[in-house]
Amino acid sequence: ATKLTEEKYELKEGQTLDVKCDYTLEKFASSQKAWQIIRDGEMPKTLACTERPSKNSHPVQVGRIILEDYHDHGLLRVRMVNLQVEDSGLYQCVIYQPPKEPHMLFDRIRLVVTKGFSGTPGSNENSTQNVYKIPPTTTKALCPLYTSPRTVTQAPPKSTADVSTPDSEINLTNVTDIIRVPVFN
């Protein structure tokens, strides 16, 4: 069995985590996908998920989490904007495939968010970035609830993560009540 591996990402408060989870295109393109946090000894907690079936390049927002599923590229893009220290933790992308157990995409992301000035011109420590005013978008009927530990028998797809550049802008379409602001890192 393949060991569950982690990639560590250290970011400052206010920055954006940008994760790309690769999946097998032909098999999972339209499958529903989710972003979960994993805490020791607990069931993984589903924080946000795509629609069922998953729509191509259609942003889904829940709070500060934005999911976009790019069918053509076989990747789920997950962004957590305006990071807070309490966002620190272990995360994973999963693909729902009822009635079978969810399929976990690897590597897991170990996110460490620290306080502190990121040193970007034009930003300051006291500034707050109210990136979104978002109505709730997920419902119980749309999003499956759990995943569970499972044995991995083959080398899984790898996830990659990066931080947005200082002049990047969160530029989403078809999303209600978005206030677009630059995210300084």
């Epitope: 607990e42 924080l47 946000a48 709070g63 500060r64 009635p99 119980k140 499956p144 609830l145 759990y146």
Partner: antibody, heavy 121, light 113 residues
Framework: QLQLQESGPGLVKPSETLSLTCTVS??????????WGWIRQPPGKGLEWIGS???????YYNPSLKSRVTISVDTSKNQFSLKLSSVTAADTAVYYC?????????????WGQGTMVTVSS | DIVMTQSPDSLAVSLGERATINCKSS????????????LAWYQQKPGQPPKLLIY???TRESGVPDRFSGSGSGTDFTLTISSLQAEDVAVYYC?????????FGGGTKVEIK
Amino acid sequence: QLQLQESGPGLVKPSETLSLTCTVSGGSISSSDYYWGWIRQPPGKGLEWIGSIYYSGSTYYNPSLKSRVTISVDTSKNQFSLKLSSVTAADTAVYYCARDSGQYTGSLDVWGQGTMVTVSS
Amino acid sequence: DIVMTQSPDSLAVSLGERATINCKSSQSVLYSSNNKNYLAWYQQKPGQPPKLLIYWASTRESGVPDRFSGSGSGTDFTLTISSLQAEDVAVYYCQQVYLFPWTFGGGTKVEIK
């Protein structure tokens, strides 16, 4: 409509093992969307979560009871079970089984009617 | 463990009047990343199992009358029955599912004045 029904002995002697089964009807216990849980309520008191299980067998227990609790699942019978060992009078309670969607919605959304278990010699 | 404290222990309200039940958690149950509070409210009538009323602190479960509403965030939550009906006589519990183990409040008994 999903229904849950607890069954098992209503009287257990101290130091013995309490065994209960929950039968799920109107839906599949093998749903990938849910866990299945046990909760208890001593007479005239509040609710205590005992633990939950996924159809694949993954279990999660309340640390206060973990050393004495075993929850198992039998998907072929659409049932899950609770065993609580070394019982004392303090384990006297109504035991409920429930569908556990707590990780996503924060809730136990379908409950059985409950079964009263008395621990006495 | 997160300790859930409900107040008052009991409440007597006239028919048609507002009933308010409070629940306080010993630590925040809000996931700020998805802006959801992992708190639920249940109603338990004598001899019956609990019934889910509210999840995510403020979302009514399907089929629950709209006189029941939940509010609050972080550590302080409220269940409000806007116009008490005779069938609302019950014990009400809050529950957190933010951290294991799931824990419940001690309950609030609602009666008719």
